[in-house]
Amino acid sequence: KESCDVQLYIKRQSEHSILAGDPFELECPVKYCANRPHVTWCKLNGTTCVKLEDRQTSWKEEKNISFFILHFEPVLPNDNGSYRCSANFQSNLIESHSTTLYVTDVKSASERPSKDEMASRPWLLYR
């Protein structure tokens, strides 16, 4: 029998390379049974994750899975960084792995921090 726990299917260390100025949809794949959970996005800032309250979001329902989408219209250079979605379901908080957006600003292509630096200081992303 399939579990009716809510599950969020963002892969550990997933990343997207995108261009500033383009539209982009960041998807949080959500599996649930009967009642759709309340899902939010947050953006990592240093050691904390700051809720994105005033951003456009939407749901896309498919047969076996749903997607809670964070819209970037358009992508801005400071959208660079890591994001997590979380779901509130029956008083439980379920949190996804983080997914990282690497935004290339064609006008000012800057060097991406090395993997070693990122491991040691993940908040380098938010400079």
Epitope: N45, G46, T47, E95, S98, E117, S120, P122, R127
Partner: antibody, heavy 126, light 107 residues
Framework: EVQILETGGGLVKPGGSLRLSCATS????????VNWVRQAPGKGLQWVAQ??????????YYAESLEGRVTISRDDSKSSVYLQVSSVRAEDTAIYYC?????????????????WGQGVMVTVSS | DIQMTQSPSVLSVSVGDRVTLNCKAS??????LNWYQQKLGEAPKLLIY???NLQTGIPSRFSGSGSGTDFTVTISSLQPEDVATYFC?????????FGAGTKLELK
């Protein structure tokens, strides 16, 4: 008021193991990484381990000289972090400090804070 | 590992002196360096983070500078309560490492 209390120290025999606890209150523990740092009597500071928070999976990192003998863990529901040290030897004799750290960016500037407990003494001797 | 070398290891000072403490990294650590002050029998206390930023509550007579491999902390006019040991700490790459410390003692 921020409080950090390390416990679990004392006298341990060589080859034995110990588990240090760090209980915290007065700040949002979930937003903090935690370092353990130690200081042998009359010596300098040595970084031992770090555990990140759930925003970072929560990843763990260790000093190479201690790798394989130390394990750091955390229990967010208790706002606590733990350090397990196995196969202890005389050179593990030290004061062990627990230090939660946090950072965030605002208007392009890094804001960083850390707290330190008063430390707990561990003596390894037969 | 990145080695952090502090100099001098002991410095004799007088109240009112301008004091400069040095820290040298064995590799480029950009600006990922903190300074800690430790008084006898106490836990370390963060003075400066990211090379130049004064932690809240630290007097403005303390300042930090440097980049890459060479770093300094300066006390513009030493006060009696500044007598302590000062440690630099790099968090550019694993494992994090401290310098061996510079101990200030009154002449």
């Amino acid at each position: 008021e921020v409080q950090i209390l390390e416990t679990g120290g004392g006298l341990v025999k060589p080859g034995g193991s110990l588990r240090l606890s760090c209980a915290t209150s007065g700040f949002n523990f979930n937003d903090y990484f935690v370092n353990w740092v130690r200081q042998a009597p009359g010596k300098g500071l040595q970084w031992v381990a770090q555990i990140r928070n759930k925003n970072y999976n929560p990843a763990t990192y260790y000093a190479e000289s201690l790798e394989g003998r130390v394990t750091i863990s955390r229990d967010d529901s208790k706002s606590s972090v733990y350090l397990q040290v196995s196969s202890v030897r005389a050179e593990d004799t030290a004061i062990y400090y627990c230090s939660p750290i946090s950072s965030y960016y605002h208007d392009g500037s890094l804001h960083y804070s850390d707290y330190w407990g008063q430390g707990v003494m561990v003596t390894v001797s037969s | 590992d990145i080695q952090m070398t502090q100099s001098p290891s002991v410095l004799s000072v007088s109240v009112g002196d301008r004091v400069t403490l040095n820290c040298k990294a064995s590799h480029n650590i950009k600006n990922y360096l903190n300074w800690y002050q430790q008084k006898l029998g106490e836990a370390p206390k963060l003075l400066i983070y990211d090379t130049v930023n004064l932690q809240t509550g630290i007097p403005s007579r303390f300042s930090g500078s440097g980049s890459g491999t060479d770093f300094t902390v300066t006390i513009s006019s030493l006060q009696p309560e500044d007598v302590a040991t000062y440690f630099c700490f790099q968090y550019h790459s694993w494992p994090y490492t401290f310098g061996a410390g510079t101990k200030l003692e009154l002449k």
